[in-house]
Interface confidence: low
């Protein structure tokens, strides 16, 4: 008769560094001590006629275990054989590039390191919640790789790495691991230059705004910009709108920043640049100013009229020009009546980068002179008729600007000067006229001869 | 469940600003990108911009000329959409509405709310 | 900007009939990652939209399978293949593979 050394549990699965409960047993009557054979730690823990029971501890690798029995002088052996399932102790999603151009490949890379049984291993890389890749798990550490095509939708797409134990053939399931997920950041910077809206010219201590702008980027609102005049960095105010990105600012020149300059604007985007230069000369405009000696002067005095400017300006004082540009330009004269209220014009001319910027500026004279009466505006004989309406059409001038009044002799009679009124016989007489003024004082005398009114 | 709740109706002089709130729930408010979407009376429907909470990257319409304004608050899973100079026919009911990025598209909808725009 | 366009306007149909409504785009929506971004959607009466059908062909989750998407470049078309009572509504398609999204002008379907 043959007979038979079981060995319970047939073909057990337990996780990494467990414990197994393993029972050799014999229908032979007259078997010896029943033996185990395994390079396990392991402990008996019972035994019996045709049985013995052993527990096996700190289980880390596949293993056989063979169980041998001497019966009637033979040797009878059993085996079991264990498999040991444990999930990895890393899984690692490799980190992304900082920036990823559109449509520009880039690789995932996942590591994973432990797990077992490797045949069941299965490593899946994911965007989103879509797999992108599914590969078993080779080598230690298990590296799997996957090439992706970025999009402008996988920016701020999350990535990430799973592994999956599949241990459900065995009856114990599907054991997953993910990794930390990594955020994808794609971006678009086109290859032409910015556009760069500058002045050709700027004068010190004025503003002018610059623009800057750059279309076809994506995410417009995560570009940097950069905006200067020469080594002077301008305060940009930066507005996207869907990919087009400008950036504003207000250029103001220092005096110590005249001659030829560069505006320049810089665009950074995922580490690349795009730049755009123009050219700006700076420059100093300063007049023209015109002078007088004496704002107001006197009559019959000299008054001198002068016409300046900065450095490198051409003058030119009511048609004369000065000598040579940054000089000054004048000119005398002797201050007459006629010259009261007299504008002197300047105009200034600037040369810069073959333009000609052009710029005037005047002056006005007072003369200060006595009291005169126009003749020519004063009749010194009226003949009107008695009960009718008419005016003195007399006029007066002089600088300060004199007092008019005409007062009958012999009597304070005034009649009213440049204001229509009505004449009768009272009128008739003769008038002083005078304009007065704290230059003095001017006397006409005005005859009014009134005819009596009719009545035949 | 995924939910979007918006702000109640407004009614808004010539010249004036309205802005509109979106609540999430239900979900990871930085994982999905919100958009915003108007409907005049009786007509079709109009895209005006989205936001990514997670960046706050925003994409509009240029069609409203830099008048509307989309944000993000995510510690509240709140997202807003500011409409400036309003005029009568922005006078319109204006939804929210969340996409994931795989499938693109609107799957998740705010009720609406009718801003009025009038003297 | 794509511009987006469907026919019919108003689709009178009897419960039970197919119907069938086409949209077409001013130029492709084939992105460059060669995804088509087309999608359709149905509101309904004093209802916000909802989405139908996303990427040409895919149904969203829970959306009965009598309705089906076709299509490709700049040529689509929603079919129902058995109209019931809570289909009726108007259903717009829109494209989200070029800035800005745009959405077609709408389809009635309504009772004959």
């Known amino acids: 008769q043959e007979f038979l050394l079981r060995v319970e549990p047939q073909n057990p699965v337990l996780s990494a560094g467990g414990s197994l409960f393993v029972n050799c047993s014999t229908d032979c009557p007259s078997s010896e001590k029943i033996a185990l054979e395994t390079s396990l730690s392991k402990e008996l823990v019972a035994s019996g006629m045709g049985w013995a029971a052993f527990n096996l501890s700190n289980v880390t690798g596949n293993s056989r275990i063979l169980c041998s029995v001497y019966c009637n002088g033979s040797q009878i052996t059993g085996s079991s054989n264990i498999t040991v399932y444990g999930l990895p102790e890393r899984v690692e999603l490799a980190p992304l590039p900082p920036w990823q151009p559109v449509g520009q490949n880039f690789t995932l890379r996942c590591q994973v390191e432990g797990g077992s049984p490797r045949t069941s291993l299965t490593v899946v890389l994911l965007r989103w919640e879509e797999e992108l890749s599914r590969q078993p798990a080779v080598e230690e550490p298990a590296e799997v790789t996957a090439t992706v095509l970025a999009s402008r939708d996988d920016h701020g797409a999350p990535f990430s790495c799973r592994t999956e134990l599949d241990m459900q053939p065995q009856g114990l399931g599907l054991f997953v691991n993910t990794s930390a997920p990594r955020q994808l950041r794609t971006f678009v910077l086109p290859v032409t230059p910015p556009r760069l809206v500058a002045p050709r010219f700027l004068e010190v201590e004025t503003s002018w705004p610059v623009d800057c702008t750059l279309d076809g980027l994506f995410p417009a609102s995560e570009a940097q910009v950069y905006l200067a005049l020469g080594d002077q960095m301008l305060n940009a105010t930066v507005m996207n709108h869907g990919d087009t990105l400008t950036a504003t600012a207000t250029a103001t020149a220092r005096a110590d920043q005249e001659g030829a300059r560069e505006i320049v604007c810089n665009v950074t985007l995922g580490g690349e640049r795009r730049e755009a230069r123009e050219n700006l000369t700076v420059f100093s405009f300063l007049g023209p100013i015109v002078n007088l000696s004496e704002p107001t002067a006197h009559e019959g005095s000299t008054v001198t009229v002068s016409c300046m400017a900065g450095a490198r300006v051409q003058v030119t004082l009511d048609g004369v020009p000065a000598a040579a540009p940054g000089q000054t330009a004048q000119l005398q004269l002797n201050a007459t009546e006629s010259d009261d209220g007299r504008s002197f014009f300047c105009s200034a001319t600037l040369e810069v980068d073959g333009e000609f910027l052009h710029r005037n500026s005047s002056v006005q004279l007072r003369v200060l002179y006595g009291p005169k009466i126009d003749r020519a505006t004063c009749p010194q004989h009226l003949k009107w008729k008695d009960k009718t309406r008419h005016v003195l059409q007399c006029q007066a001038r002089g600088n300060p600007y004199p007092e008019l009044r005409c007062l009958k002799e012999g009597s304070s009679r005034e009649v009213p000067v440049g204001i229509p009124f009505f004449v009768n016989v009272t009128h008739n007489g003769t008038y002083q006229c005078q304009a007065s003024s704290s230059r003095g004082k001017y006397t006409l005398v005005v005859v009014m001869d009134i005819e009596a009114f009719s009545s035949h | 469940q995924v939910q979007l709740v918006q702000s109640g109706a407004e009614v808004k002089k010539p010249g004036a600003s309205v802005k509109v709130s979106c609540k999430a729930s239900g979900y990871t408010f930085t994982d999905c990108i919100i958009l915003w979407v108007r409907q005049a009376p009786g007509q079709g429907l109009e895209w005006m911009g989205k936001?990514?909470?997670?960046?706050?990257?925003?994409t509009y319409n240029l069609k409203f000329k830099g008048r509307v304004t989309i944000t993000a608050d995510t510690s509240t899973s709140t997202a807003y959409m500011e409409l400036s100079s309003l005029r009568s026919e922005d006078t319109a009911v204006y939804y929210c509405?969340?996409?994931?990025?795989?499938?693109?598209?609107?799957?998740?909808w705010g009720q609406g709310t009718l801003v009025t725009v009038s003297s | 900007d794509a511009v987006m366009t469907q026919t019919p306007l108003s689709l009178p149909v009897s419960l039970g009939d197919q119907a069938s409504i086409s949209c077409r785009s001013s130029?492709?929506?084939?992105?460059?990652?060669?995804?088509?971004?087309l999608h359709w959607y149905l509101q309904k009466p004093g209802q916000s939209p909802q989405l139908l059908i996303y990427?040409?062909?895919n149904r969203f989750s829970g959306v009965p399978d009598r309705f089906s998407g076709s299509g490709s470049g700049t040529d689509f078309t929603l079919k129902l293949s058995r109209v019931e009572a809570e289909d009726l509504g108007v259903y717009f398609c829109s494209q989200s593979t070029h800035v800005p999204y745009t959405f077609g002008g709408g389809t009635k379907l309504e009772i004959k």
């Open positions: 509405a969340r996409k994931e990025a795989y499938p693109d598209a609107m799957d998740y």
């Open positions: 936001i990514n909470p997670y960046f706050g990257t925003t």
């Open positions: 990427k040409v062909s």
């Open positions: 130029q492709s929506l084939v992105h460059s990652n060669g995804d088509t971004y």
